[in-house]
Amino acid sequence: EAHKSEIAHRYNDLGEQHFKGLVLIAFSQYLQKCSYDEHAKLVQEVTDFAKTCVADESAANCDKSLHTLFGDKLCAIPNLRENYGELADCCTKQEPERNECFLQHKDDNPSLPPFERPEAEAMCTSFKENPTTFMGHYLHEVARRHPYFYAPELLYYAEQYNEILTQCCAEADKESCLTPKLDGVKEKALVSSVRQRMKCSSMQKFGERAFKAWAVARLSQTFPNADFAEITKLATDLTKVNKECCHGDLLECADDRAELAKYMCENQATISSKLQTCCDKPLLKKAHCLSEVEHDTMPADLPAIAADFVEDQEVCKNYAEAKDVFLGTFLYEYSRRHPDYSVSLLLRLAKKYEATLEKCCAEANPPACYGTVLAEFQPLVEEPKNLVKTNCDLYEKLGEYGFQNAILVRYTQKAPQVSTPTLVEAARNLGRVGTKCCTLPEDQRLPCVEDYLSAILNRVCLLHEKTPVSEHVTKCCSGSLVERRPCFSALTVDETYVPKEFKAETFTFHSDICTLPEKEKQIKKQTALAELVKHKPKATAEQLKTVMDDFAQFLDTCCKAADKDTCFSTEGPNLVTRCKDALA
């Protein structure tokens, strides 16, 4: 229904706390360089204005759209051009072009320092001093670094953070209580960020239809007892929620997500038998829980998929009458039978099925033509299954760090022109798939591996889009979203690449590396490894292992030495010489 004042409506629906949190996230995602204090001031002004509209919906400007209200606030920020350059040009436009312009200026890789977690004691002191301001800083710091983070989900992570601090700051050993818990939240939040960015990419590049297909497959796997009409309704609603969040309409997104959670909990009987525990939780936890609820038990009496989609004499007629609905039912039926497949694979199969019908229904004898379509799915299914087996075997053999290094070598050979920091980040993220997925039961591995890899590769594509340097990467990133992972997997050594000349300074290290945390040490070593591959793209695994073992030994020796600086300055050049010889 239409409301006289949109801002009053959203304030009433969401409540002050969530309203303020979402407005802070929205501003932080649009203007990523502004400080927390600057944004907090704007949030307070918007909230005060919303309250006047709640009191009197006819008050001045209360009838304006949220984009107009928020955009006007952002455009009133002093020194906008000095701090944000051409983003300031957005302010010369009218809505809806102005909001589109802001969206286009979101930076997926902002030049902000990595957020270092402060010491436990200091965190607890400042959290106790002002929990609201502390959590505001958390929202701001995450949102500006992840401009497409799913806003209602970020509120959920902030709530988790708050609960952890409340619990651990009361403990004697705050550090050992906080560290594992906050590490867990951070890991989950980072995965959530790349997954949501993938959804927004799908929406931006291929439109709502592509996202809705993703949603149908995912929901059908999770709720195999729901009928097609129910799945379609859920997919339509979920598409709307995601479109709003990806489009910066965070208040609407959070409000609609709450409505969707409410609907699901009120209609459990027709959706799934697994929802009750989620539905007993408060709002943020409920919506989060529903988004990752376990798959319902598959109906025992499902007929073979071939009956309706291959053997039926009316296949072409049914397809011609309503293509999207027919393909939707195929995707639904296939997905509910295959919780063990990745969504990407299910969408590739649906695409193959569509292409087969397009070709065969134009021929003289369609059934003879499309009769083998299910058999033609086999290679498409085998490819990711083999990928999972090969990579999980390698992960089990090498462990996470060694597996990351193997991926780093592989991807540096595929795209040596890509910057070393991007390659290292990508390889570290891709390598985490082992820890995340390879320990799962067999039937959960494939969906976990492939859908996670697809999300990470989407980030590689976004970073590469900014400064395209590799034709290999451009080729894989230009195609459809579901074909990206197979495309990257199929890439081999880039034969067009002219190896980098050997620079001794790239492999020169100083004693400060000894005091770095383990993660930073790994990144330094992985940076050196990528540079080695760029110097010798065709180096064998054995050669690279020799060099890296030597390098690790050198670090170990010099970091244990009484005079570290002398050790690094004398042994370092010897290491560089040995490396050159080993790779000659």
Partner: nanobody, 116 residues
Framework: EVQLLESGGGLVQPGGSLRLSCAAS????????MDWVRQAPGKGLEWVSS????????LYADSVKGRFTISRDNSKNTLYLQMNSLRAEDTAVYYC?????????WGQGTLVTVSS
């Protein structure tokens, strides 16, 4: 790497005012309590003032109470010390310090000379 850079010191007459600044980098400034510490010529270190993460709590040495005001701007990662009614005994090198946490970090100091 943590860096603290003080500025604003100089020569001032008794009864005059100065405002010291400390630009912080290399750590999450808004989470930490910050302090000012001074060292008069030939003397030991003397704690002057401290401020909590969000500025809600401030503490002062008795010798400066009512004359000095500590403040911070978390959006600029900067700590301040407003010094009024300066006396000859306030002459010292003033250090900005991050004393909470596992390690202490100090700036290189800024010299304040109060003399007629």
């Amino acid at each position: 790497e943590v860096q603290l850079l003080e500025s604003g010191g100089g020569l001032v007459q008794p009864g005059g005012s100065l405002r010291l600044s400390c630009a912080a980098s290399g750590f999450t400034f808004w989470v930490y309590q910050m302090d000012w510490v001074r060292q008069a010529p030939g003397k030991g270190l003397e704690w002057v003032s401290s401020i909590s993460a969000f500025g809600a709590k401030t503490l002062y040495a008795d010798s400066v109470k009512g004359r000095f005001t500590i403040s911070r701007d978390n959006s600029k990662n900067t700590l301040y010390l407003q010094m009024n009614s300066l006396r000859a005994e306030d002459t010292a090198v003033y250090y900005c310090a991050k004393l909470s946490g596992k390690f202490d970090y100090w700036g290189q100091g800024t010299l304040v000379t109060v003399s007629s």
